[in-house]
């Protein structure tokens, strides 16, 4: 706390410059109005004012506004915005995309911070969904965030939301989100074309369920091996021989090299030795020829 | 042309005090902030702080706090950095140079456009 | 402080060739508030860049900066003879100002 001390004859701040530098902390305090200081935010980060010297900046702010900043305040608050503590800004109502990424770019090559997830969940619970404006700009910052919401905060993603996503947005993303962001990306694409499609729905593919994948087996698509190792195993493992050999293409021969992986090694296990040596590559594992398989599965759904 | 002409290369003692100068010539002397920087052997650029010459304002970086003197005399257009107690550690070349003037609205630089030639300082028993 | 950190230390490339030096802050460096100078040995550093991407004046054009928050570089399209130099880039966004420790790039 900085004692409140007067402030020296000809030292009033008339506006925010760069002779504000020379202050000491306790004369910035006595002599920097903080309203002045509010309606002139936008010139505290041209100025190279010392950490402690934005720490009085702060203090003299949350004095002004102990509710919370308005809006003019937060986009121009720059380094301030890193003195920030979630507490402060639960107490905001942020509502433009300019504002935001305003804020983001002060954090720009930082890992997410907490000040910043707070930050980001009162815009969104602002908005009231996450839109594709602001997908956008999140992912851009952060090409992790899709990824570090739940399921149930994905499930406010509206379809049209989906095109803002890159595949690189995705990486990070387990099977369980993958669910819920699959069948909006279908939605969203519905009306590509086959090849286009495939390049627009493959980065969700984790997501699908088996009857999607025996369509795309159909449609010559040639899925890459990365792309069929994140498949779901429960999706891949009803999936035929030929079906597999129609849904790879010519990456079919990535098989052998994956073949102890999940869902490969999976998959191998409930195919036909015969049908898994159609394909010419060695793979090991399979049923004997004549042993009969039995889907217990479908008699536990019955009892 | 703008320039900067430093003093000569000095030698002291641990313990005792140094003083450079740094003269301006070629451009309006206190229109421009003057700031000091070093180089010790080896090493990387150290800033060590701002004076503005038209009302004596100075500005330190924390590591040289208590230790250093800015001033200047706007009659000969001239800047001086006083170091005291000096150790080997103070063993470098020291910079003045002049802020840059490259300023829009209030979006202020304080890059440094103009260089002195660097001054020589050896501290040694 | 804001401690920035250059890499590599050492650059060895030929003449004719595009030179590209990183420079990275520990904090984020709001409003692009950093400079790239070249600094020879027994020489006055000279400001190459100024605001992250604004030349200074007189400096070719085959030298340019980028950059945003906390990582920044420079790049030497084509590498002349005199382009041999240590090169530091220097924060003044937040006091006290602070340098990288300099890269060095020299003829392979």
């Known amino acids: 706390e900085v004692e409140k001390t007067a402030c020296p004859s000809g030292k009033k701040a008339r506006e925010i410059d760069e002779s504000l530098i020379f202050y000491k902390k306790w004369e910035l305090e006595a002599c920097v109005d903080a309203a002045l200081l509010a309606t002139q935010m936008d010139r505290v980060n041209a100025i190279p004012f010392t950490y402690e010297q934005l720490d009085v900046l702060k203090h003299k702010l949350d004095e002004l506004y102990p509710q919370g900043y308005p809006e003019s305040v937060i986009q121009h608050l720059g380094y301030l915005f890193l003195k920030m503590s979630p507490e402060d800004i639960r107490k905001w109502n942020v509502t433009s995309l300019e504002t935001l990424k305003a804020l983001l770019e002060v954090n720009k090559g930082h890992e997410m911070s907490p000040q910043v997830a707070t930050l980001i969940d009162r815009f969104v619970k602002g908005r009231g969904q996450l839109d594709k404006d602001t997908l956008d700009t999140l992912t851009a910052f952060y090409p992790g965030y899709l990824c570090s919401l739940s399921p149930e905060e994905l499930s406010s993603v509206p379809p049209s939301s989906i095109w803002a996503v890159r595949p690189q947005d995705l990486d990070t993303c387990d099977p369980r989100q993958l669910d819920v962001l699959y069948p909006k990306a279908r939605l969203a694409f519905q009306n590509m074309n086959g090849s286009e499609y495939f390049v627009k729905i493959q980065s969700f593919l984790g997501g699908a369920p088996t009857e999607d994948l025996k369509a795309l087996s159909q449609q010559n698509v040639s899925m890459d091996l990365a792309t069929f190792m994140k498949l779901r195993t429960d999706a891949v493992l009803p999936l035929t021989v030929a079906e597999v050999q129609k849904l790879l293409g010519p990456h079919v021969e990535g098989l052998k090299a994956e073949e102890r992986h999940r869902p490969v090694r999976d998959w191998i296990l409930r195919q036909r030795q015969d049908d898994l040596d159609t394909l010419g590559l060695g793979l090991q594992g399979g049923i004997p020829n004549g042993y009969l398989v039995l889907d217990l599965s479908m008699q536990e759904a019955l009892s | 042309q703008v320039q900067l002409v430093q003093s000569g290369a000095e030698v002291k003692k641990p313990g005792e005090s140094l003083k450079i100068s740094c003269q301006g010539s070629?451009?309006?002397?206190?229109?421009?902030?003057i700031g000091w920087v070093r180089q010790a052997p080896g090493q990387g650029l150290e800033w060590m702080g701002w004076?503005?010459?038209?009302?004596?304002?100075?500005n330190y970086a924390p590591k040289f706090q208590g230790r250093v003197t800015l001033t200047t005399d706007t009659s000969t257009s001239t800047a001086y950095m006083e170091l005291r107690s000096l150790t080997s550690d103070d063993t470098a070349v020291y910079f003045c140079?002049?802020?840059?003037?490259?300023?829009?609205?209030?979006?202020?630089?304080?890059?440094?456009?103009?260089w002195g030639q660097g001054t020589t300082v050896t501290v040694s028993s | 402080e804001i401690v920035l950190t250059q890499s590599p230390g050492t650059l060895s490339l030929s003449p004719g060739e595009r030179a590209t030096l990183s420079c990275r802050a520990s904090?984020?460096?709001?409003?692009?508030?950093l400079a790239w100078y070249q600094h020879k040995p027994g020489q006055a550093p000279r400001l190459l860049i100024y605001?992250?991407?604004t030349r200074a004046a007189g400096i070719p054009d085959r030298f340019s900066g980028s950059g945003s928050g906390t990582d920044f570089t420079l790049t030497i399209s084509r590498l002349e003879p005199e382009d041999f130099a240590v090169y530091f880039c220097?924060?003044?966004?937040?006091?006290?100002?602070?340098f990288g420790p300099g890269t060095k790039v020299d003829i392979k």
């Open positions: 140079a002049r802020r840059g003037r490259n300023s829009s609205g209030y979006l202020y630089y304080y890059s440094m456009d103009v």
């Open positions: 070629g451009y309006s002397f206190t229109d421009y902030w």
């Open positions: 004076i503005t010459p038209n009302n004596g304002n100075t």
């Open positions: 904090q984020p460096i709001v409003a692009s508030h």
């Open positions: 605001g992250a991407s």
């Open positions: 220097q924060q003044y966004g937040i006091s006290p100002f602070t």
